[in-house]
């Protein structure tokens, strides 16, 4: 067993049928000695009298708000939490598997830059008695600061018959320069409480592996004389780290005619312009990637060719 | 990317196209590696990052942009020499361009070029032969550092008198190769921002 | 005590369907999680289904997967695997097992895929 | 499609100690907990060994489980006649979990 916060408990539980359960002694926070009673949740059944209540904790029926009173008056509180352990892996009941980058990926996390700013969601479709918290650190054994915001509801989604909830957070690391070159990653903690289950979900990551620029901006055409081609121009994103010399994009343009199957025609290049065929009905698309370090695409930009 | 590509002229900066080629040379040989050892722990989740120039050399701060030297972050070892020299900078070019951080990348070359060739040495007598080195990323080194044109001691090629574990050899090269990928992005970040300035 | 007791096994013809039933008592069946796991004759033992305690997700083997159906009546304690589409490589013992470091397993009923 | 390879058969004397390996790879065993079951003919496996080493009570002492990076060993310290059986380890992919991956199947045989 141990604390969660003030007054709050985990009590963890190798989950299994018939498992015997782990024994908790809860103590009532008072001086008093004499005349203390305890009850589980709304119950006015009488567990137990004196300053210490020895529980046998097995299922979720045994865990709840633990009160201590005495002559009708509350002393206080121990609220009681189970985390189940199943064949050795601790549950995760809670939160969805996203899949994606992999199997068992719960929380997914990006940057728009090295500022050391990132956004961690994850999904669930559960819809009550429901709260996250959040910490995060660079590095495990001797952590360094990053600073995370409260987790917030930020889309609801229809999946079949199932209802789909996306909770999101940001976090900013407290000292970082966006040209380091990082050697620790960034841990990320999630604890989800719902109703009396507690399950904890951690991800780790580099910022240069989770980075994914926005879309290029000022996505423009301009006509060429006598010609079926365009040249067309765009920005580097205003979220973008600066200065760009240093921290370069490269851009993917693409032309895509209105059906999806027909051939789309691609260029790849480090200016923010390029020359290509505006077929008619076609759109022209622009995204970015950091030059040098390969991680994600950024959202396309688009314009239509007419 | 096996598709049109619009390259820019390196132009006047002899030093970019050679930092590209390392930078391509060297996620090669990273992704060659993680395929041949992918029983081995060699994925960027599994290793230790560390960082063989650690101490030795100061490449990022010296390298600093002029507009992150206003950030405190990036400031906690800074050195301020701005002398300059070395082949890859045209006179003229000044500002930003300080010999201690071209000085930097090409100590960092050496000291990577020696670990690989001795690292290599050590492979070529594993009798499973299931990875070398690259020649051309070797080589490729060689070229930067010669662009670069310092004139700095050789270091001596380690030897090794006590029978190599080839277990332990494996999984300090993809260590090696991550750090040295790194390090490539950054000197492509610093020769772009050179060639720009 | 824990118990799970199986049927529904028999001979089929390949591509009829069968359904599998394994009833549990002695414990709290709605709280934990419950698998399939079958051995053709002679062979070693495979994973075929396992259903989360609530039946919000349902895993499956490949050599399985659109085939076979693991659900779960909890008002009812019981376990279910529909089998449709059957084969002769699906000939074997079926066993439903509990889920957790220690697990229970029912006495296993035999499927047979015969012509 | 098994992952998990353990010897076709062991054998040995009353009284002798014989092991079986359970090799596998860092995303199965080298990252989660193994299992050993051991299956008389006829019946359901029956658990010897959860968490690697751990022994459930009933389950004679005997018989000892341990873990090496991604490989697992059962030993029997003592083998009796009725230790003849097939024997099983089981883990889990940490790609694929909670499918059980269970290992080859060992045949051991009590000589004398």
């Known amino acids: 067993i141990w604390e969660l916060k003030k007054d709050v408990y985990v009590v963890e539980l190798d989950w299994y049928p018939d498992a015997p359960g782990e024994m908790v002694v809860l103590t009532c926070d008072t001086p008093e000695e004499d005349g203390i009673t305890w009850t589980l949740d709304q119950s006015s059944e009488v567990l137990g009298s004196g300053k210490t209540l020895t529980i046998q904790v097995k299922e979720f029926g045994d865990a709840g708000q633990y009160t201590c009173h005495k002559g009708g008056e509350v002393l206080s509180h121990s609220l009681l939490l189970l985390h189940k352990k199943e064949d050795g892996i601790w549950s995760t009941d809670i939160l969805k598997d996203q899949k994606e980058p992999k199997n068992k990926t719960f929380l997914r996390c990006e940057a728009k830059n090295y500022s050391g700013r990132f956004t961690c969601w994850w999904l669930t479709t559960i819809s009550t008695d429901l709260t996250f918290s959040v910490k995060s650190s660079r590095g495990s054994s001797d952590p360094q600061g990053v600073t995370c915001g409260a987790a917030t509801l930020s889309a609801e989604r229809v999946r079949g018959d199932n209802k789909e909830y996306e909770y999101s957070v940001e976090c900013q690391e407290d000292s970082a320069c966006p040209a380091a070159e990082e050697s620790l990653p960034i841990e990320v903690m999630v604890d989800a409480v719902h109703k009396l289950k507690y399950e904890n979900y951690t991800s780790s990551f580099f910022i240069r592996d989770i980075i994914k620029p926005d879309p290029p901006k000022n996505l423009q055409l301009k006509p060429l004389k006598n010609s079926r081609q365009v040249e067309v121009s765009w920005e580097y994103p205003d979220t973008w780290s600066t200065p760009h010399s240093y921290f370069s994009l490269t851009f993917c343009v693409q032309v895509q005619g209105k059906s999806k199957r027909e051939k789309k025609d691609r260029v790849f290049t480090d200016k923010t312009s390029a020359t290509v065929i505006c077929r008619k009905n076609a759109s022209i698309s622009v995204r970015a990637q950091d030059r040098y370090y390969s991680s994600s695409w950024s959202e396309w930009a688009s314009v239509p060719c007419s | 990317r096996n598709l049109p590509v619009a390259t820019p002229d390196p132009g006047m900066f002899p030093c970019l196209h050679h930092s590209q080629n390392l930078l391509r040379a060297v996620s090669n040989m990273l992704q060659k590696a993680r395929q041949t050892l992918e029983f081995y722990p060699c994925t960027s989740e599994e290793i230790d990052h560390e960082d063989i120039t650690k101490d030795k050399t100061s490449t990022v701060e010296a390298c600093l942009p002029l507009e992150l030297t206003k950030n405190e972050s990036c400031l906690n070892s800074r050195e301020t020499s701005f002398i300059t020299n070395g082949s890859c900078l045209a006179s003229r070019k000044t500002s930003f361009m300080m010999a201690l951080c071209l000085s930097s990348i090409y100590e960092d070359l050496k000291m990577y070029q020696v670990e690989f060739k001795t690292m290599n040495a050590k492979l070529l007598m594993d009798p499973k032969r299931q990875i070398f080195l690259d020649q051309n990323m070797l080589a490729v080194i060689d070229e930067l550092m010669q662009a670069l044109n310092f004139n700095s001691e050789t270091v001596p090629q380690k030897s090794s008198l006590e029978e190599p574990d080839f277990y332990k050899t494996k999984i300090k090269l993809c260590i090696l190769l991550h750090a040295f990928r790194i390090r490539a992005v950054t000197i492509d970040r610093v020769m772009s921002y050179l060639n720009a300035s | 005590q824990v118990q799970l007791v199986q049927s529904g096994g028999g001979v089929v013809q390949p591509g009829r369907s069968l359904r599998l039933s394994c009833a549990a008592s002695?414990?709290?069946?709605?709280?934990?999680?419950m698998h399939w796991v079958r051995q053709a004759p002679g062979k070693g033992l495979e994973w075929v289904a396992f259903?989360?305690?609530?039946?919000?997700?349902?895993y499956y083997a490949d050599s399985v997967k659109g085939r076979f159906t693991i659900s779960r009546d909890n008002s009812k304690n019981t376990l279910y695997l529909q089998m449709k589409s059957l084969r002769a490589e699906d000939t074997a013992v079926y066993y439903c097992?509990?889920?957790?470091?220690?697990?229970?397993w029912g006495q296993g009923t035999m499927v047979t895929v015969s012509s | 499609s098994y992952v998990l390879t353990q010897p076709p058969s062991v054998s040995g004397t009353p009284g002798q100690r014989v092991t079986i390996s359970c090799s596998g790879g860092?995303?199965?065993?080298?990252?989660?907990?193994v299992k050993w079951y051991q299956q008389l003919p006829g019946t359901a496996p029956k658990l010897l060994i959860y968490?690697?080493?751990q022994r459930p009570s009933g389950v004679p002492d005997r018989f000892s489980g341990s873990k090496s990076g991604t490989s697992a060993s059962l030993a029997i310290t003592g083998v009796q006649a009725e230790d003849e059986a097939d024997y099983y380890c089981?883990?889990?992919?940490?790609?694929?979990?909670?499918?059980?991956?269970f290992g080859t199947g060992t045949k051991v045989t009590v000589l004398g």
């Open positions: 968490g690697n080493d």
């Open positions: 860092r995303s199965n065993i080298g990252s989660n907990p």
């Open positions: 002695g414990f709290t069946f709605s709280s934990y999680g």
């Open positions: 097992k509990t889920h957790g470091s220690h697990d229970n």
């Open positions: 089981q883990s889990y992919d940490r790609g694929t979990h909670p499918a059980l991956l």
């Open positions: 259903i989360r305690y609530d039946g919000s997700n349902k």
